[in-house]
């Protein structure tokens, strides 16, 4: 969470951003809020990116003003116009790419004053893992697959019964480059699996952490997976 205050001149206003992560090949959100104003026409929102000459996005007098927008962001950005009046200056970014990573500034002017806050935006790829029993293997084996990750993550296996056990000797992880030559498919195999146990395949990089669980019993197989973005670092 980053809270910024205005500079000299008029009163300062509080602007708040949250460091966030974008999944390449999807739309992303850069979060920014500010002390609202009663008149939309008095609000100016400017998004800037460190190292980029033009603006990322500008919204003023109740509408987009894109004449100064940098070519790299042309056709890709939007604010939530109906939420600006309540203090939401968050930016929607279409088709996030690796090159969108960096430091952004959310700069606000209202009738109450000015304020700004920086935001660290990370980009990468992350996806939900799926754990299955590998029936083709000679021994009881689990296979954990996740289609898209970048940067290369770490993969760790854990089990409910053998808590704290190190499975690195009985697992094998491979990374296969996807066709767009950026993201990779993650495949991890765990050998010598015992019945009536819950196993977890944990995939993590500096952007996201995902876990795929599988419970294998004599009568059934239960699966569960979840993904968490590692984005709310305080500054």
């Amino acid at each position: 969470l980053i809270i910024g205050f205005g500079i000299s001149g008029r009163h300062s206003i509080t602007v708040t951003t949250v460091a966030s992560a974008g999944n390449i090949g999807e739309d992303g959100i850069l979060s920014c809020t500010f002390e609202p104003d009663i008149k939309l026409s008095d609000i100016v929102i400017q998004w800037l990116k460190e190292g980029v000459l033009g603006l990322v996005h500008e919204f003023k007098e109740g509408k987009d003003e894109l004449s100064e927008q940098d070519e790299m962001f042309r056709g890709r950005t939007a604010v939530f116009a109906d939420q600006v009046i309540v203090g939401n200056a968050s930016l929607r970014l279409k088709n996030v790419q690796l090159t969108d990573a960096g430091t952004y500034k959310c700069y606000i002017i209202t009738s109450k004053g000015k304020g700004n806050a920086n935001l660290e935006y990370k980009t990468g790829a992350f996806s939900m893992p799926e754990v299955n029993v590998d029936y083709n293997a000679s021994s009881e084996t689990l296979r954990c697959e996740a289609p898209r990750w970048f940067p290369q993550p770490t993969v760790v296996w854990a089990s409910q019964v053998d808590q704290g056990a190190n499975f690195s000797e009985v697992s094998n992880t491979s990374f296969e480059l996807n066709s767009e030559n950026v993201t990779m498919k993650v495949v991890s195999v765990l050998y010598n699996v015992t019945i009536n146990n819950t196993y977890s395949c944990m995939i993590e990089n500096d952007i996201a952490k995902a876990t795929g669980d599988i419970k294998v019993t004599e009568s059934e197989i239960k699966r569960r997976s979840h993904l968490q973005l590692l984005n709310s670092k305080a500054s």
């Epitope: 390449i24 090949g25 279409k94 790829a125 996807n178």
Partner: antibody, heavy 116, light 109 residues
Framework: EVQLVESGGGLIQPGGSLRLSCAAS????????MNWVRQAPGKGLEWVSV???????DSADSVKGRFTISRDNSKNTLYLQMNSLRAEDTAVYYC??????????WGQGTTVTVSS | EIVLTQSPGTLSLSPGERATLSCRAS???????LAWYQQKPGQAPRLLIY???SRATGIPDRFSGSGSGTDFTLTISRLEPEDFAVYYC??????????FGQGTKLEIK
């Protein structure tokens, strides 16, 4: 040259299935948002489905649960699997690339006719 | 759901005249996500304008786009015979993800 070529259209009975293909050349399908857009005879354009660069998909309510968009990265090809077809699905189906600033490349279209 | 309403439905003009086509959204649309297309009979649509006002590659400068919020305009400054076609506006980013207007037919008077 950047190009999209659709195939797979034809005459099909109500309730039937059909798979449309869209072969791309000159660019990588998986780096773009790829769409299917249709146009019923004498009508306007209607968005059908999208597959994001990430592989996630979304579809119009009118086709949800019946149509599935997918891609084969190794073949650089987009697909539309159409099940439980209805008379109102009769249209020319276009695949189109969204290169961040609008649907800038379109195929020539393939005609799907649903009739008994 | 954002509805795009184009007017007029049909516009009858002569070559050399100026054409003004309107696209009105039922709620605010980001200028970045508003595009215009031209479609001729038997052909696929062609992107003309993106980001409400930027011309796509190879589009002549007689085509221009303007507007913001809920009101957008496509202007053809001086009509050429090849400009007579159907024109669609389109927005991105709401549900459904892509929405088209119903079209304006530009015909020769």
């Amino acid at each position: 040259e950047v190009q999209l070529v659709e195939s797979g259209g034809g005459l099909i009975q109500p309730g039937g299935s059909l798979r449309l293909s869209c072969a791309a050349s000159g660019f990588i399908v998986s780096r773009n948002y790829m769409n299917w857009v249709r146009q019923a005879p004498g009508k306007g354009l209607e968005w059908v489905s999208v597959i994001y660069g990430s592989g996630r998909t979304d579809s119009a309510d009118s086709v949800k649960g019946r149509f599935t968009i997918s891609r084969d990265n190794s073949k650089n090809t987009l697909y539309l699997q159409m099940n439980s077809l209805r008379a109102e699905d009769t249209a020319v189906y276009y695949c189109a690339r969204d290169a961040d600033y609008g649907l800038d490349v379109w195929g020539q279209g393939t005609t799907v006719t649903v009739s008994s | 759901e954002i509805v795009l309403t184009q007017s007029p439905g049909t516009l009858s003009l002569s070559p050399g005249e100026r054409a003004t086509l309107s696209c009105r959204a039922s709620q605010s649309v980001s200028s970045s996500y508003l595009a215009w297309y031209q479609q001729k009979p038997g052909q696929a649509p062609r992107l003309l304008i993106y980001g409400a006002s930027s011309r796509a590659t190879g589009i002549p400068d007689r085509f221009s786009g303007s507007g913001s919020g809920t009101d957008f305009t496509l202007t053809i400054s001086r009509l050429e015979p090849e400009d007579f076609a159907v024109y669609y506006c389109q927005q991105y980013g709401s549900s459904p993800l892509y929405t088209f207007g119903q079209g304006t037919k530009l015909e020769i008077k």
